[in-house]
């Protein structure tokens, strides 16, 4: 976890302001508004079973 | 510090109904996926039901085994989880769960409480 | 629905050596990018813990002897060294489509 403005979260995460931590690309899957998913490069869709079993 | 707890477990003849509770504290449950998940020596743990967020509409998803005999609900005013269980069978005995997730896995895991269903 | 089917189901290790347990998914939990696949342990009357999200990406709070690798369908949890307190049974749990699925377990014992 990182504060803003220190080094950037790792790789394949990215600094949530809401959460106050760094966060995994992959729950932008799932939760595809986070405010996190902004700086991840691209959130893949969610298989159709997943939003729409 | 995180706390989820469980109950409302017990034992009820096979036909009963029972509904578990959970409380949550130490997080914001507003903003987490919650779920029910059993574990029994048979089955091992099972995912059961999960419901998500009022953004969401409070979706709810369930496995086939309990789809239209169990149902999971939420309070998020008071921060609770529910699950309402009826026709409970014997394979329904074991130990709940309430988890909580901020995406699809499960972060935060109660005791548990324990179901047996017998005559 | 994805079955998960972890082995060995038991295994014993000694003190500082390497724990490796293996699940494989019948059908593939990745994408080009992620893996959806979660690792946890579970002691004796306790409830299961979170110890790797997305295959590889330890919870916080979790020691790095712990780690996870594959995708697509091979899935592996490393720990090394190994801690007396490490005895448990671990399981992984794949969320790539509902309904989540848990595999049967790997009981470690350390000698």
């Known amino acids: 976890e990182q504060a803003p403005g220190t080094a950037p979260c790792s790789r394949g995460s990215s600094w949530s302001a809401d959460l106050d931590k760094c966060m995994d690309c992959a729950s932008c899957r799932a939760r595809p508004k986070s405010d996190f998913c902004l700086g991840c490069a691209a959130a893949p869709p969610a298989p159709f079973r997943l939003l729409w079993p | 510090e995180v706390k989820l707890e469980e109950s409302g477990g017990g034992l009820v003849q096979p036909g009963g109904s029972m509904k578990l509770s959970c409380v949550a504290s130490?997080?914001?449950?507003?903003?987490?996926?919650m779920s029910w998940v059993r574990q029994s020596p048979e089955k091992g743990l099972e995912w059961l039901a999960e419901i998500r967020l009022k953004s969401d509409n409070y979706a709810t998803h369930y496995a086939e085994s309990v789809k239209g005999k169990f149902t999971i609900s939420r309070d998020d005013s008071k921060s609770r989880l529910y699950l309402q269980m009826n026709n409970l069978r014997a394979e329904n005995t074991g130990i709940y769960y309430c988890?909580?997730?901020?995406?699809?896995?499960?972060?935060?895991w109660g005791q548990g409480t324990t179901l047996t269903v017998s005559s | 629905d994805i079955v998960l089917t972890q082995s060995p189901a038991s295994l014993t290790v000694s003190l500082g050596q390497r724990a490796t347990i293996s699940c494989r998914a019948s059908q593939s939990v990745s994408t080009s990018s992620y893996s959806y696949m979660q690792w946890y342990q579970q002691r004796p009357g306790q409830p299961p813990k979170l110890l790797i999200k997305?295959?590889?990406n330890l919870d916080s709070g979790v020691p790095a002897r712990f780690s996870g690798s594959g995708s697509g369908t091979d899935f592996t949890l490393n720990i090394h060294p190994v801690e007396e307190e490490d005895a448990a049974t671990y399981y992984c749990?794949?969320?790539?489509?509902?309904?989540?699925?848990f595999g049967g377990g790997t009981k470690l014992e350390i000698k």
């Open positions: 997305y295959a590889t």
């Open positions: 749990q794949h969320s790539w489509e509902i309904p989540y699925t």
């Open positions: 988890t909580g997730g901020f995406a699809d896995y499960f972060d935060y």
């Open positions: 130490g997080f914001t449950f507003n903003n987490y996926w």
